[in-house]
């Protein structure tokens, strides 16, 4: 399986909300002995590889933001803890999972990573990740809404 990032760059005005998205691709084993753990964290384009370093998102660690379930089941993070920080991560039945960040500030700018671990009980753990950049802008040059740039091309889309 693979992880796709529909958008590689999100450019948002200060104060806006944004939802960063990843998608699980490929054959997903829905067997009893396979589960998936998904999480989010901040990182940097490191010397070893992108997303190798795991930093908190608004003081919430990747442990706090873990989603854990089998196959394409839906899941949400602990609402109280995440929402106190203006965050919510979620996963649907179709392999999409996301993190929503509310009331963006300039400090939210940076590289964000989604991580999926496929746990085949009695056998192995396999991990894949996706990366995307968030730029929070302020002032007259800032867009009125978030503008997202697809990973496959440089065409941009406005999202409200």
């Amino acid at each position: 399986f693979k992880v796709a990032t529909p958008y590689s760059l999100y450019v948002c005005p200060e104060g806006q909300n944004v939802t960063l998205t990843c998608r699980l691709l490929g054959p997903v084993d829905k067997g009893h002995d396979v589960t998936f753990a998904k999480t989010w964290y901040r990182s940097s384009r490191g010397e070893v590889q992108t997303c190798s370093e795991r930093r908190p998102i608004r003081n919430l660690t990747f442990q706090d933001l873990h989603l854990h379930h089998g196959g394409h089941q839906a899941a949400n993070t602990s609402h109280d803890l995440a929402q106190r920080h203006g965050l919510e991560s979620a996963s649907d039945h179709h392999g999409n999972f996301s993190i929503t960040m509310r009331n963006l500030t300039l400090l939210d700018s940076g590289l964000y990573c989604c991580l999926v671990a496929e746990i085949r009980h009695h056998h192995s753990e396999h991990r894949v990740h996706g990366a995307m950049e968030l730029q929070v802008q302020t002032g007259k040059d800032a867009p009125s809404n978030c503008v997202v740039y697809p990973s496959s091309s440089q065409d941009s889309e406005n999202i409200t």
């Epitope: 009893h32 753990a37 873990h66 854990h68 991580l115």
Partner: antibody, heavy 117, light 107 residues
Amino acid sequence: QVQLQESGPGLVKPSETLSLTCTVSGGSISSYYWSWIRQPPGKGLEWIGYIYYSGSTNYNPSLKSRVTISVDTSKSQFSLKLSSVTAADTAVYYCARDIPAFAFDIWGQGTMVIVSS
Amino acid sequence: EIVLTQSPATLSLSPGERATLSCRASQSVSYYLAWYQQKPGQAPRLLIYDAFNRATGIPARFSGSGSGTDFTLTISSLEPEDFAVYYCQQRINWPLTFGGGTKVEIK
């Protein structure tokens, strides 16, 4: 802050069943994996197995025929049962939180179990 | 089962010296390797995950490196509280396994 606390008898007779419980406090048991790990006196660490809150388990093949790990989410507890014990099962038994794509990040303080008649 | 072999079994050093601990896997574990520190009478404490990432609250003098089958834990300048036993652990395959440990003792 999540904390783990092991409890159970410190002395078990040979051929009997060792039973331990780990209580999770300060956080939810309804995510992550919850493992048992043991350490014989003066020796290294051995992973026994884990349970997920849904009840799915994974055991070390070397112990699988004798091990049962169960969970009681209403009490935020998970338990270890090891049957037909011998002196070789004498060890400090630890419970630990296991996060996929990470590690054993939180451990109980451990409880010494001696197998002796 | 993946066997992790740690060397040396014992390392005798003085405070302020550099400690280099090795962990070798019987087959590739990619970078899915953690290091733990254990002091007498205490539970192990996570130091490093994914071969080189420091866990929360771990001082910068601890660093990890390696991938595949050969890994190193380095303590750049030993503090008195660093004298302990160190274990590596892999999590690419089950059963999860630990190395036999390296004891870092005061010379």
